[in-house]
């Protein structure tokens, strides 16, 4: 059965997924999809990497960890109730039927009536789309229009706080980390 993760409307959701590359930078393609993992690939792909970098993405979905070290955990920005459901993290190991598949259940709760402001929410309101420890380049007009030139490395501490949350430990403790090579 799926491991369950929770987030509130308006917050960022974190869905952990890890693997151990055979060698540093020797990446395995990964896809994230909405819906349970099918036999092949990912259904309703929201993000994909190849052997080098992120090559397919949709707005609000990010890899905030160091994916070159195997942290392919997904962050979904500013979630709504519609983001609830099963997500598939698929580690696409070469060879027939070698893929590792993880189904993660995301439960979105309505926001509290009078939510106390948090650093995280204040940050994402000011700079939606830029919450990442990795440079993902310029803002896209589809999501933001224009955005001041922000140095993404200045905000890595906050992303680290997200990544080091209890949810990350939950998955690590459950043994859903794979080693390749």
């Amino acid at each position: 059965s799926e491991v369950e993760y929770r987030a509130e409307v308006g917050q960022n959701a974190y869905l952990p997924c890890f693997y151990t590359p055979a060698a540093p930078g020797n990446l395995v393609p990964v896809c994230w999809g909405k819906g349970a993992c099918p036999v092949f690939e990912c259904g309703n792909v929201v993000l994909r990497t190849d052997e080098r970098d992120v090559n397919y993405w949709t707005s609000r979905y990010w890899l905030n960890g160091d994916f070159r070290k195997g942290d392919v955990s997904l962050t979904i920005e500013n979630v709504t109730l519609a983001d609830s459901g099963i997500y598939c993290c698929r580690i696409q190991i070469p060879g027939i039927m070698n893929d590792e598949k993880f189904n993660l259940k995301l439960v979105i709760k309505p926001a509290k009536v009078t939510p106390a402001p948090t650093r995280q929410r204040d940050f994402t309101a000011a700079f939606p789309r830029m919450l990442t420890t990795r440079g993902h380049g310029p803002a896209e007009t589809q999501t933001l229009g224009s955005l001041p030139d922000i140095n993404l490395t200045q905000i890595s501490t906050l992303a680290n706080e997200l990544r080091d949350s209890r949810l990350a430990n939950d998955l690590r403790d459950s043994g859903a980390t794979i080693r390749i090579g």
């Epitope: 930078g25 994909r48 080098r52 970098d53 992120v54 090559n55 397919y56 993405w57 949709t58 707005s59 070159r68 420890t133 990795r134 440079g135 993902h136 380049g137 310029p138 896209e140 007009t141 589809q142 999501t143 030139d149 922000i150 140095n151 993404l152 490395t153 200045q154 890595s156």
Partner: antibody, heavy 118, light 106 residues
């Protein structure tokens, strides 16, 4: 094997609009990646102009934002650059290139020279 | 915008030499730096991405290092086909390139 090929007029008059097209073969533009325009004035360095992503979202160099438009024609697997109100300073070799979400560039076209002159 | 200052702007070297090119960012760009090689009349070719990862097909004599603001491209043993101009590029915010380093035959 992915290939990119720029095309368009080699001579544009000042104040007019420069229009270039990049034809992509070996990969569908809508399948992924960011599709970029980069230019290089004669004897000078490289300048990133902007991109259109696989989903159609765009991002532009702030220094060009008021003059630049990048669009895509998925039926022809092409993306295009329009740069308005050109001056002699826009004379350059124009390259199209395929980039990642973090925009670094693995595949480049061979480049096309555009001269702005009356 | 983020300026990338490359040095030297040109250098003369012999086949077999070890060549080092540096690039300094005007602010912290993490490891979000790429290096390209360009020969006259040709498009640039990708050498290094994410500061230290060699692009596929790039010979092992090319290596990249650095993080934050200081980055280095090293050619461990210069070969005849390596005489070219080299550019660094940051992609921590909208992409900007260094001014280039021309590697010439001594």
């Amino acid at each position: 094997q992915v290939q990119l090929q720029e095309s368009g007029p080699g001579l544009v008059k000042p104040s007019q609009t420069l229009s270039l097209t990049c034809t992509v073969s070996g990969y569908s533009i809508t399948s992924g990646f960011a599709w970029n325009w980069i230019r290089q004035p004669p004897g000078k360095g490289l300048e990133w102009m902007g991109y259109i992503s696989h989903s159609g979202s765009t991002s532009y160099n702030p220094s060009l934002k008021s003059r630049i438009t990048i669009s895509v024609d998925t039926s022809k697997n092409q993306f295009s650059l329009k740069l308005s109100s050109v001056t002699a300073a826009d004379t350059a070799v124009y390259y199209c290139a395929r980039g990642y979400r973090s925009p670094w560039f693995a595949y480049w076209g061979q480049g096309t020279t555009v001269t702005v002159s009356s | 915008d983020i300026q990338m200052t490359q040095s030297p702007s040109s250098l003369s070297a012999s086949v077999g030499d070890r060549v080092t090119i540096t690039c300094k960012a005007s602010q912290n760009v993490g490891a979000n730096v790429a290096w390209y090689q360009q020969k006259p009349g040709k498009a640039p070719k990708s050498l290094i991405y994410s500061a230290s990862y060699r692009y596929s097909g790039v010979p092992s004599r090319f290596s990249g290092s650095g993080s934050g603001t200081d980055f280095t491209l090293t050619i461990s043993s210069l070969q005849p086909e390596d005489f070219a101009t080299y550019y660094c590029q940051q992609y921590n915010s909208y992409p900007t390139f260094g001014g280039g380093t021309k590697v010439e035959i001594k």
